[in-house]
Structures are given as C-alpha cells and as structure tokens.
Interface confidence: medium
C-alpha cells in the first residue's frame, strides 16, 4: 500500500499509503468512490493550524480538487510540535462527474502557521470508473 511520491518540500514526508496502490504502479482513483490517503510526516515547525491544499493536473490542465476539507487538524491531533512525527488519514469522496484521465498528477500540500509542513507529488494516478 506504500506509494512512491516526489517530495516538493524538504523531505518531511516519511511515507504515503494508499489502499490498493503500490510503489510506482498506476494508482487508480475511482469516480464516485472514496479515495483514502495516509501520510506520515515530521513537523518542521510548531504550529496550531494545519491546512490541506490539493491540486490535480488532468491531461495538463491544473484544477482545484473539489470537496476537500482544508482543515488538516480534523484528521490528526493538533497542535503540531516541531520534530514530532504525525500520521494523517484523509478520505476524499471522488465526484461521480470527475473527468476520466490516464494522465493525472496530484499535488498534496500541508501548510502550517509558518509555511509548508509537507508536500508530495504523485505522478502515476489515473481517474477511471
């Protein structure tokens, strides 16, 4: 279930897990179904807030992902203390009307009070029924 991602911050992310996805194999996002994501990262700052930002590039067109709860503190115990590891489990209900694509790049960023807490890019996602 551990997937390969590109770090887009300072290697705060220790691992990313997606049920049914492995390594650098294609990771299928099914339309109209929940998509589960778990990430373990080390806090690079003391922060009492943590905000999730998810963007997707679908066939080269960048879009904001709808239906995202931006408050990361709903999914892990805040406040975060610098140097401690945190486990965030997040479920996104994929819209039924999401476009099908074989070329999806997803960027997940977690922002703290003092900037980026963690950032990961998944380059091998696909949206299918």
């Amino acid at each position: 279930d551990q997937v390969d991602v590109k770090d887009c911050a300072n290697h705060e992310i220790k691992k990313v897990l997606v049920p049914g996805c492995h390594g650098s194999e294609p990771c299928i996002i099914h339309r109209g179904k929940p998509f589960q994501l778990e990430a373990v990262f080390e806090a690079n700052q003391n922060t009492k807030t943590a905000k999730i930002e998810i963007k997707a590039s679908i066939d080269g067109l960048e879009v904001d992902v709808p239906g995202i709860d931006p408050n990361a503190c709903h999914y892990m115990k805040c406040p975060l203390v610098k140097g401690q590891q945190y486990d965030i489990k997040y479920t996104w209900n994929v819209p039924k009307i999401a476009p099908k694509s074989e070329n999806v790049v997803v960027t997940v960023k977690v922002m703290g009070d003092d900037g980026v807490l963690a950032c990961a890019i998944a380059t091998h996602a696909k949206i299918r029924d």
């Epitope: 003391n46 009492k48 408050n71 709903h74 805040c78 975060l80």
Partner: antibody, heavy 121, light 113 residues
Amino acid sequence: QVQLQQSGPELVKPGASVKISCKAPGNAFSYSWMNWVKQRPGKGLEWVGRIYPGDGDTNYNGKFMGKATLTADKSSNTAYIQLSSLTSEDSAVYFCARSGGGTLYWYFDVWGTGTTVTVSS
Amino acid sequence: DIVMTQSPSSLALSVGQKVTMNCRSSQSLLNSFNQKNYLAWFQQKPGQSPRLLIYFASTRESGVPDRFIGSGSGTDFTLTISSVQAEDLADYFCQQHYNTPLTFGAGTTLELK
C-alpha cells in the same frame, strides 16, 4: 497519570477579585490550549474559556465575558484565570484542563487538581 | 449553544452488572468529512478531577479499561460499562467537542447496590 498543578483554595469577599494558577509540566505547554472549567455542586461542568499560551490567543464562553480573564506565562508554563466582581454564584471548584489545538480536538485529556473558590462575607 | 442531555441522572447496580447511560445532543455532532462524532465521556470520582475515558464517541483513551465502551452517532450516544467494578462508582459526564462554547451534560451518577 500527569496532572496540572493548581493553586490552593481561596476564600474571598463579595465584590473582590481572585487569581488562580495552573502549572503544566514539560515544554508542550505552549502548543496546547489551556481551558478553564467551572463546577458547582448540582450544576455540572461549565466551560469558561481557553488560552493558547504560544501566542496568548483566547476564546471565552459568552456567559463568562467580563467575569473571567485568562492569561499565561510561557516562561513558567503557568496559566491563570482571574475572576472579578465576585458573588456567591462564583463559588465553585475551578479546573484547568489541556486540549489539543486542532479545530475539533477540543476534548480535555489532562486535568488540573482543582481550586475551590468560596465567596463569603 | 449545543445542549447536552444525559439520562438517567443516577443508576444503582451490583458489581458485575452491565450498565448503559445515554447522552443526547441538540444538534448533530457528526463531521460529514471524516465521519467522526465529536463527543467525549469523562469519569469523575468523589473529590477528584474528571478523567477522560472516550473521545470521538468511541475511541478509548490510553489506559482506560476495555470494559468502557462508547457508541452512537449524530445526536444519540451511549456509554456502556460491560461489567461494573467497585472502582467505577463515580459521576459520568458527556461533552461535545464539536463547537464552542464547549458544553457538558449534567451527568449520570453510578452508585453500587
């Protein structure tokens, strides 16, 4: 189990003010909310408000606005509640309690020892 | 404000019996994004500070015996003690951690026969 250490009982006259302290162990003090809870016999528990010692941010229960003032001293890991214009209705046990900072992690996982305030002439 | 209503106000049981107490909120405590219910249960023994037993309606705090079981969703919640022990003599309070002002139920007193 870890407990927050509170100051001793207070006997105060009506109209006076009182300040209670709550000392937390360790360095996580600045990164938790410190809450105050009032308990009167037969009246259950009432949330007074909370302070985030890291930056002094406060939230109050509207019922206690003007009655309670919350402060904190990061250097000594101590939170304070000051109660003013005291009446018999303010006679109660006051607890401090720690909660997480996340928007909805507002349950109290560590409690203080409690301070009894008695308002009497 | 969210009003929390507990029932019954008191219970008298014998050691080994199963006990169930209820807590109802005036509005739903379910977060639809993560399907968590923002309800906590506390135990307070005479002359002591409250102690956290359960949060997110059913997650047991570390060190809490597994005879304490939290359940329920939305507006209706239950704390069950599967086999009451003498040391469980206490008041039990529910608290919503969904919105400020944070509010508590009036409590259920557990007495032993």
